[in-house]
Amino acid sequence: SGTTNTVAAYNLTWKSTNFKTILEWEPKPVNQVYTVQISTKSGDWKSKCFYTTDTECDLTDEIVKDVKQTYLARVFSYPAGNVESTGSAGEPLYENSPEFTPYLETNLGQPTIQSFEQVGTKVNVTVEDERTLVRRNNTFLSLRDVFGKDLIYTLYYWKDSSTGRKTNTTHTNEFLIDVDKGENYCFSVQAVIPSRTVNRKSTDSPVECMGQEKGEFRE
């Protein structure tokens, strides 16, 4: 069904990192425009990206209202210059996205090591608590605020002079590890949500090594 010379969107794909969420689709429009709708299972459809020639739509503002809900989006196709026109069913062509549950599926962004501090044979490594676009009481929540104990960080660390790598985990954003005195160490961290079945791990943070600007050293 559908209007002559319009084609339905296809390959609808969610791209989401730390809850910043974009719906992408194909094809690039030729003589047609798109409107996107998004809804939870309530069926209260909200229109976004009206009559656009883009093939992506930022739906972050909608999904951050409740990241634990499951969302569906649909992309409507209209003839350019005649958006009131409908198909033989009396409705424009449309296609549904896959279901998307942000809390379970948003990719974990690459973390950043905020600082590390050595005191004797111990090093405290702090991971930056990244701000998300999820709001509560008009303030933006951090990744830790949203995920709580579901989120852990894994620390990988090794002596500058060695290839042997050690690991440590934390349910907070801080690690306290034992090191050998007089040795320089390098660090990388990874965000993990162990309870997930997909998108469980972030990419590794950039490597930070002792003796560089992020560190503090105290005897």
């Epitope: 069904s1 309530s42 069926g43 209260d44 459809w45 809900q69 009396g90 409705e91 549904n96």
Partner: antibody, heavy 118, light 107 residues
Framework: EVQLLESGGGLVQPGGSLRLSCAAS????????MSWVRQAPGKGLEWVSS????????YYTDSVKGRFTISRDNSKNTLYLQMNSLRAEDTAVYYC???????????WGQGTLVTVSS | DIQMTQSPPSLSASAGDRVTITCRAS??????LAWYQQKPEKAPKSLIY???SLQSGVPSRFSGSGSGTDFTLTISSLQPEDFATYYC?????????FGQGTKLEIK
Amino acid sequence: EVQLLESGGGLVQPGGSLRLSCAASGFTFSNYAMSWVRQAPGKGLEWVSSISGSGDYTYYTDSVKGRFTISRDNSKNTLYLQMNSLRAEDTAVYYCARSPWGYYLDSWGQGTLVTVSS
Amino acid sequence: DIQMTQSPPSLSASAGDRVTITCRASQGISSRLAWYQQKPEKAPKSLIYAASSLQSGVPSRFSGSGSGTDFTLTISSLQPEDFATYYCQQYNSYPYTFGQGTKLEIK
């Protein structure tokens, strides 16, 4: 466990009115669209009406438009179908069903029989 | 309105058989199709949505396929509890419509 329990069916004369209720439990009622589907004796299924979780959007099959009104009370976890100007052809078992996105029907009640006869 | 035509209207089969029921829409509905099972004097039960997605708790012997106008429900190995009437339903556009049903009987 999702439970839907219809009530309010019975015998009514042509031209009469009836209000069906559907009490929902086991899920967050306001998070789901809901629907009514009917089945005349010995016949197949017929979609009647749907309503969004907020109650802002309602939809009807042509044969009941202007006669039936779907509504919901999210504070009571209850779905309603107000049926006016009833006709013999409205005789059926009426099922309430949960309807994710207002699309398919993933959980059904046991049904309530409405008989329109003089 | 979109018409949904199921075939066959009735079907006799034995436990262990592989059974296929088809549903044809009068116009394209993409994958916006559901399948239901109904036993006598009981409410329908959801089996499949989005043409091929299995409803939670439904045995894996049930599967759905198709897109556009032609759809199938397959039961890979019939069990005694599968003898029932099966309905397809389109949810592409209002008014939503059902097929007339396929009655699956014991041979």
